[in-house]
């Protein structure tokens, strides 16, 4: 099916992203009208070779003409009009630079395919991404259910056969002993010779039948164990491994992981079948002790069957011991696996074999870096002790679903101090936020005469001693869990693997979607790709090193990509969450694209984006205005940082923002939020009504209080303001008189504004870089 047709069938949330992909520079109608032809061209090649771009561009115009004549025959006036308009636009814009249109189309096609890929992945991971925990049963899982049912049935069938063989054996034993006691066996020469011979034949026949049945049971047991092994492999190597991978993904902001209950039911069912089978194998031993003979299959095969069932059960129990909730500080629920020394963290383990007889029987002990004592010393890692309640008994009462689990709520880490400030070795090759540690959980199970040592461990954690290390620590957690499903590679950062843009893009989007109501659009991600990788057409498959992601400073900046982005994430969550959720913040957009989309819009159209120069995270707005000569200008205000947003909400800043023109008149340059949403409609609801801004005046006082209002003003007294950020000045107060400012008519007392600036207005233009 053509890519465009596939896209039409996607969920609304994906179609929204598709809409964001298209703009005037490559209209969606054109994509629709010429879908098959557009998809058949090599745009990426055209984007890199001018001669080919020219050829493709002329062919495109030809295709438009052909489509136009089709609409002519169909008398479709609207489509004719649109197509003529599109052709004129393309000619005026790209005739001289055909490589530019090729680059735009190539990028759109790539982003489309990425969108399809994302949708397909979400579907595979359990249906609707808006119901990620929904219990969607895949075909594979149905097969698994079937296999488990088959195992249970075979166990029950064997139970019946065991009863039958026991009956036959008891009957044989009875007959044998009766004949023996009556001395019939010796009496073959006597009068009863034929009767005795007949009885002996019957006895031999019974023994043959018994042997056949025993062989059949032994063979069926071997087959059953193979079936169990297959189901167990599917459960542990696929289903449980999938759950663990999904847990990693959920830890780094991806879709929430599915609940473990179904997996627990499957594993418990298999464990029950295994114990029943073990009892059957024990029963064989009893039978053999009562009656045995030369070539007895029980003697031959039972020890191996016993060994296999014990091994299977042991391994199943070991696999079933999992970390249900990875270590996490309660104050940072969205950043698990980063632990600050001295700060409590919680974690939870669960045994997916739900045997009531194990309730309150398993004592779990927690420790850190259990197996890496020597390795840690060699590597120069820090060493830690776990403080707090580090043992807990597993029980079924604490969890609301009755699972056998133990939750540790009061654990803390303390660094073991060494002579050289805590590092076990001065030559430590890794910085502390790249040092990975494992928290291990151990217990012993005694069940039906078996002793099984259980051990599981958390995903690698990063231990910090200061909260300022959180951004880099979190980057390490992202990089690790994005690139490996190895649960315990503590040496990961000695040679960190390279990620692809597709992987990084998805994880970056999760950083927003996990704590806000929206992830990053294709357009936003493309801007981020440009920041990381430079200008390009198709970022898919492009490689990103760990250093580039979070260690090296960005070109011309004094900070890394990740530090910059993490501060923006923080800014969004703490200061502009509602606006981000509404989709009002374009956020990541290149200067070129910003200019392209705003330059065709009427004056007063503005958009909101993040500052590229502010390390601490800043947000700014850019608007369109006409200068004296009527020429379109694009202006940006100096970014607002967390410090400023602490004092005044961004919505209020936007609503109140003014510029002071040369004649000292205050004008609001922000009218429509891009593309055409009236400012009041978008931001009005996020501003406090003026009546609530201050308490009522003292009723006993002679005159009402004057109301004040903070607004931001930018003076525009210079002519060279094009594209330079404008520095906002706070207009200290705008005072209104009359009836507390509520519904006062000008005639009833008038309104006037008194302007006070909290800093001297200067005529220089702000030139801080963006």
């Amino acid at each position: 099916m053509a890519q465009w047709n596939q896209l039409q069938q996607l969920d609304t949330r994906y179609l929204e992203q598709l809409h964001q992909l298209y703009s005037d520079s490559f209209p969606m109608e054109l994509r629709q009208f010429l879908a098959p032809w557009i998809e058949s061209q090599d745009w990426a090649y055209a984007a890199s070779k001018e001669s080919h771009a020219t050829l493709v561009f002329h062919n495109l115009l030809g295709e438009i003409d052909q489509q136009y004549s089709r609409f002519l025959q169909e008398s479709n006036v609207l489509y004719q009009h649109n197509l003529r308009r599109i052709k004129q636009f393309l000619q005026s814009r790209y005739l001289e630079k055909p490589m530019e249109i090729a680059r735009i189309v190539a990028r759109c096609l790539w982003e489309e395919s990425r969108l399809l890929q994302t949708a397909a992945t979400a579907a595979q991971q359990g249906g609707q991404a808006n119901h990620p925990t929904a219990a969607v049963v895949t075909e594979k899982q149905q097969m698994l259910e079937q296999h488990l049912q088959d195992v249970r049935k075979r166990v029950q069938d064997l139970e019946q056969k065991m009863k039958v063989v026991e009956n036959l054996q008891d009957d044989f034993d009875f007959n044998y002993k009766t004949l023996k006691s009556q001395g019939d066996m010796q009496d073959l020469n006597g009068n009863n010779q034929s009767v005795t011979r007949q009885k002996m034949q019957q006895l031999e026949q019974m023994l043959t039948a018994l042997d056949q049945m025993r062989r059949s049971i032994v063979s069926e047991l071997a087959g059953l164990l193979s079936a169990m092994e297959y189901v167990q492999k599917t459960l542990t190597d696929e289903e449980l491994a999938d759950w663990k991978r999904r847990q990693q993904i959920a830890c780094i902001g991806g879709p929430p992981n599915i609940c473990l209950d179904r997996l627990e039911n499957w594993i418990t069912s298999l464990a029950e079948s295994q114990l029943q089978t073990r009892q059957q194998i024990k029963k064989l031993e009893e039978l053999q002790q009562k009656v045995s003979y030369k070539g007895d299959p029980i003697v031959q095969h039972r020890p191996m069957l016993e060994e296999r069932i014990v091994e299977l059960f042991r391994n199943l129990m070991k696999s079933a011991f999992v970390v249900e909730r990875q270590p996490c500080m309660p104050m940072h629920p969205d950043r698990p696996l980063v632990i600050k020394t001295g700060v409590q963290f919680t974690t939870k383990v669960r045994l997916l074999v739900k045997f009531p007889e194990l309730n309150y029987q398993l004592k779990i002990k927690v420790c850190i870096d259990k197996d890496s004592g020597d390795v840690a010393a060699l590597r120069g890692s820090r060493k830690f002790n776990i403080l707090g309640t580090n043992t807990k008994v597993m029980n079924m009462e604490e969890s609301n679903n009755g699972s056998l689990s133990a939750e540790f709520k009061h654990l803390t880490l303390r660094e073991q101090r060494c002579g050289n400030g805590g590092r076990a070795n001065c030559d430590a090759s890794l910085i502390v936020t790249e040092e990975l540690h494992l928290i291990t959980f151990e217990t012993e199970v005694y069940h039906q005469g078996l002793k099984i040592d259980l051990e599981t461990h958390s995903l690698p954690v990063v231990v910090i001693s200061n909260i300022c290390q959180m951004p880099n620590a979190w980057a390490s957690i992202l990089w690790y869990n994005m690139l490996t499903n190895n649960p315990k590679n503590v040496n990961f950062f000695t040679k960190p693997p390279i990620g692809t843009w597709d992987q990084v893009a998805e994880v970056l989007s999760w950083q927003f979607s996990s704590t806000t109501k929206r992830g990053l659009s294709i357009e936003q991600l493309t801007t981020l790709a440009e920041k990381l990788l430079g200008p390009g057409v198709n970022y898919s498959g492009c490689q990103i090193t760990w250093a580039k992601f979070c260690k090296e400073n960005m070109a011309g900046k004094g900070f890394s990509f990740w530090v910059w982005l993490d501060n923006i994430i923080d800014l969004v969550k703490k200061y502009i969450l509602a606006l981000w959720n509404e989709g009002y913040i374009m956020g990541f957009i290149s200067k070129e694209r910003e200019r392209a989309i705003l330059s065709t819009k009427p004056p007063g159209t503005f958009l909101l984006r993040f500052s590229e120069s502010s390390k601490e995270g800043g947000v700014t707005f850019t608007w369109v205005e006409k200068d004296i000569s009527g020429k379109t200008q694009i202006q940006s205000v100096e970014p607002y940082t967390k410090q400023q947003l602490n004092n005044m909400s961004f919505a209020e800043i936007i609503m109140g923002y003014k510029i002071m023109d040369a004649t000292n008149i205050l004008v609001s340059p922000l009218v429509y939020l891009y593309p055409d949403i009236p400012k009041e409609e978008a931001f009005g609801k996020y501003c406090r009504p003026e009546s609530q801004e201050h308490p009522e005046a003292d009723p006993g006082s002679a005159a009402p209080y004057l109301k004040t209002k903070f607004i931001c003003v930018t003076p525009t007294t210079c002519s060279n303001t094009i594209d330079l950020p404008m520095s906002p000045r706070t207009l200290d107060s705008l005072m209104q008189f009359g009836n507390n400012g509520e519904g006062a008519e000008p005639s009833a007392g008038g309104q006037f504004e008194s302007l006070t600036f909290d800093m001297e207005l200067t005529s220089e233009c702000a030139t801080s870089p963006m």
């Epitope: 039958v164 009956n167 036959l168 009957d171």
Partner: nanobody
Amino acid sequence: HVQLVESGGGSVQAGGSLRLSCVASTYTGCMGWFRQAPGKEREGVAALSSRGFAGHYTDSVKGRFSISRDYVKNAVYLQMNTVKPEDAAMYYCAAREGWECGETWLDRTAGGHTYWGQGTQVTVSS
């Protein structure tokens, strides 16, 4: 659950012989034969326990019919000799898991579950 499949029925002349066979899906302690003539109640004919190898017979067939078992094939056989017109009936193979199958089972007073075959018809011409 035990499945029973009979064979060997048919027409036999009075005074002649016939051999009925029945194969069970699994081993049972007790196997036997019952019959039902039109308009009459089902009656026990012969049974053989897995213990003691002694057959039990209803009085009317003693000395003429002989029951035997093959433990390997899980089969029971009824050898019918000197057949009489009153032997004509539908013959049913029966089995039960316990080994007690003497007269009490044949006269249907024994407890416990009995499994039945579909039956095989025996007709006697004079």
